[in-house]
């Protein structure tokens, strides 16, 4: 049997946010139901995690031996602290789209570990804000965006923006 440390060396995690409790659930991406040491985990989910606080989970299973895999859960900031904002200037709304993630509230997570991603059509931008220029007037554009904390996606949003009519004579 392999050690649990070896078996689950590359385990990945998804973070799910509960807007009512303002707590996260970490979903462990494994095929079998694992044990989580002192932490309670139901169906491979660790519940009631506070934003920006680390939690340590010892992952074990009868298919592997000691030592257990010690997984540090780096809990992201609360989702409601981020808003996707349309920053397009009215006078340029016929050929321009501007989108920006705004942090409307402070948090204690290290901002160095936050990355932002936009995808508009086949264009990908790793920025907190984007400005698309020279677009067609009166066209619909869809932009998907996500925020990652330590490379784990914890929130995403999509915007469908229709550019304005062009000015007469253009």
């Amino acid at each position: 049997k392999p050690t649990c440390d070896e078996k689950y060396a590359n385990i990945t995690v998804d973070y799910l946010y509960n807007k009512e409790t303002k707590l996260f659930t970490a979903k462990l991406n494994v095929n079998e139901n694992v044990g989580c040491g002192n932490n309670t985990c139901t169906n491979n989910e660790v519940h009631n995690l506070t934003e920006c606080k680390n939690a340590s989970v010892s992952i074990s299973h009868n298919s592997c031996t000691a030592p257990d895999k010690t997984l540090i859960l780096d809990v992201p900031p609360g989702v409601e602290k981020f808003q996707l904002h349309d920053c397009t200037q009215v006078e340029k709304a016929d050929t321009t789209i501007c989108l920006k993630w705004k942090n409307i509230e402070t948090f204690t997570c290290d901002t160095q570990n936050i990355t932002y991603r936009f995808q508009c059509g086949n264009m990908i931008f790793d920025n907190k804000e984007i400005k698309l220029e020279n677009l067609e007037p009166e066209h619909e554009y869809k932009c998907d965006s996500e925020i990652l904390y330590n490379n784990h996606k914890f929130t995403n949003a999509s915007k469908i923006i229709k550019t304005d009519f062009g000015s007469p004579g253009e």
């Epitope: 920053c87 501007c98 920006k100 705004k102 942090n103 409307i104 509230e105 402070t106 901002t111 160095q112 936050i114 932002y116 920025n127 907190k128 804000e129 984007i130 400005k131």
Partner: antibody
Amino acid sequence: EVQLVESGGDLVKPGGSLKLSCAASGFAFSNYDMSWVRQTPEKRLEWVAYISSGGVSTYYPDTVKGRFTISRDNAKNTLYLQMSSLKSEDTAMYYCARRYDVWWYFDVWGAGTTVTVSS
Amino acid sequence: DVLMTQTPLSLPVSLGDQASISCRSSQSIVHSNGNTYLEWYLQKPGQSPKLLIYKVSNRFSGVPDRFSGSGSGTDFTLKISRVEAEDLGVYYCFQGSHVPMYTFGGGTKLEIK
């Protein structure tokens, strides 16, 4: 270590131009909105320019609008302030300061660079 | 523009005393999102300003608990419960609610009596 270092301050004649730079290190510069704040010889603090994290939005008070231009190069982790049509009342210590998004706070300031406008 | 008026201009205190600085805005600085972005900065001689308090009453990390902020609407106060020698300098209030027209108060110099 998180650091902001301003440079480019000088003695310049009224009507002249000057470009200030602010080199950032130790943090994810492209995640931060940035501002220039100046301190007059009378020790008053005045906000003079703001730029959003990706350089999309810029704002200025009426006192410098049309004369000052804030810009940034996220690849070089550098903030700039281009000043033209300088007046004697622009004489001040110029600080760059980071603000994590528009509503947070100025948590890191540089040591400042001195601009003197005099004939 | 939002005018921020600080009083007093100068505040002579004895070490160990309480100090209180007032900041009044010319209009409400409650943002439409419900928050009030009122900050306090301290500038010691020969240094750049340092953040003390944000959002009226929240102490920035590393700021001693003898510093406290309070107020609402247009009237705000910074209190230092027991002044120490390292607290001397110029205190500035700042409003960040009316974006992007940021404004600082005129400053209050805290000095030894």
